[in-house]
Interface confidence: medium
């Protein structure tokens, strides 16, 4: 009897959908695996007789529930199927956006770039899929614990009237208000403000 794949899960970030599993202990030799997806009531092969422990399902429709399954094989024997259900638009992890930060005197000027989507047009981003897409920006004075959050209305934001000659750190994530779904934070970017540009009269 061939044991089934273990710890079967979908690792999906920005709609790059990778079904992953672990090979079970099997004394007779090396196992291969076949992964399939349900399409119009019929299971279709996606990865056949692979020695890998993952299979790329990024071409699935972003909408609706998909049934995926994987089994282990050895010679003419095979394990039972292990099934999972996956809805990309609900289940994919929102990866960190890009961010450009520029210091202008006592202000930080930030521009945000929504994560690109795998297997789509060059210009296609997560904003194109989620119409409520917005950004959360979190910033703090370097070395302090108190953090502040803002929700920019656009793809850019300016933090004004900051303390001069002080290092501020900023990070951004995507957020979907209509789903209460938060993405991953970007790595913090820390920049030092310069002087206050106001000229004393």
């Amino acid at each position: 009897m061939v044991p089934p794949p273990e710890n079967v899960r979908m690792n999906s970030v920005n709609f790059k959908n990778i079904l992953q599993w672990e090979s079970p202990a099997f004394a007779k030799g090396n196992l291969t695996f076949t992964a399939q997806y349900l399409s119009y009531r019929i299971f279709q092969d996606k990865c056949m007789n692979t020695t890998l422990t993952e299979c790329d399902f990024s071409s699935l429709s972003k909408y609706g529930d998909h049934t995926l399954r994987v089994r282990a094989e050895f010679a003419d024997e095979h394990s039972d199927w292990v099934n999972i259900t996956f809805c990309p638009v609900d289940d994919t992890i929102i990866g960190p956006p890009g961010m450009q930060v520029e210091v202008l005197a006592d202000s930080l000027h930030m521009r945000f770039l929504a994560p690109k989507i795998e297997n789509e047009y060059e210009t296609w981003t997560m904003k194109n899929v989620y119409n409520s897409w917005t950004y959360n920006v979190q910033y703090w004075k370097n070395g302090t614990d108190e953090k502040f959050q803002i929700t920019p209305q656009y793809d850019f934001e300016v933090l004004r009237n900051l303390e001069p000659w002080t290092t501020y750190c900023v990070q951004v994530r995507g957020f979907l208000p209509d789903r209460n779904k938060a993405g991953e934070w970007s790595e913090p970017v820390c920049e030092q403000t310069t002087h206050d540009e106001t000229v004393p009269s």
């Epitope: 917005t134 959360n136 959050q149 803002i150 957020f175 209460n180």
Partner: nanobody, 111 residues
Framework: QVQLVESGGGVVQAGGSLRLSCAAS????????MGWYRQAPGKSRELVGY???????QYGEPVKGRFTVSRDNGRNTIFLQMNNLKLEDTAVYYC?????WGQGTQVTVSS
């Protein structure tokens, strides 16, 4: 860790009003925007109303013009004023903030 606790649910007649509250506790310094969601039996969770940091609001289509989201000055409590309630407003109402959920409060609209 932030905790969200809803209150104010109950049974109300169609056409009536109800006001829900959601109190946030824990590390709320970054909790500037919060919203209300609901889940009716056999349906998926949907947006009711959301309030952003700057006071902007966003509402789900079924409740526009009837429900209003507001918050206190400390921003640690958010309210949902529900007017002209309909039978189809019956659901469990959840408070949500940046991926965190409250436990929900039941609202039942009777005829």
């Amino acid at each position: 860790q932030v905790q969200l606790v809803e209150s104010g649910g109950g049974v109300v007649q169609a056409g009536g009003s109800l006001r829900l509250s959601c109190a946030a506790s824990g590390s709320t310094s970054t909790l500037d925007h919060m919203g209300w969601y609901r889940q009716a039996p056999g349906k998926s969770r949907e947006l009711v109303g959301y309030m952003f940091t700057d006071g902007r609001t966003q509402y789900g289509e079924p409740v526009k013009g009837r429900f209003t989201v507001s918050r206190d000055n400390g921003r640690n409590t958010i309210f949902l004023q529900m007017n002209n309630l309909k039978l189809e407003d019956t659901a469990v109402y959840y408070c949500g903030a940046q991926g965190i959920w409250g436990q929900g409060t039941q609202v039942t609209v009777s005829s």
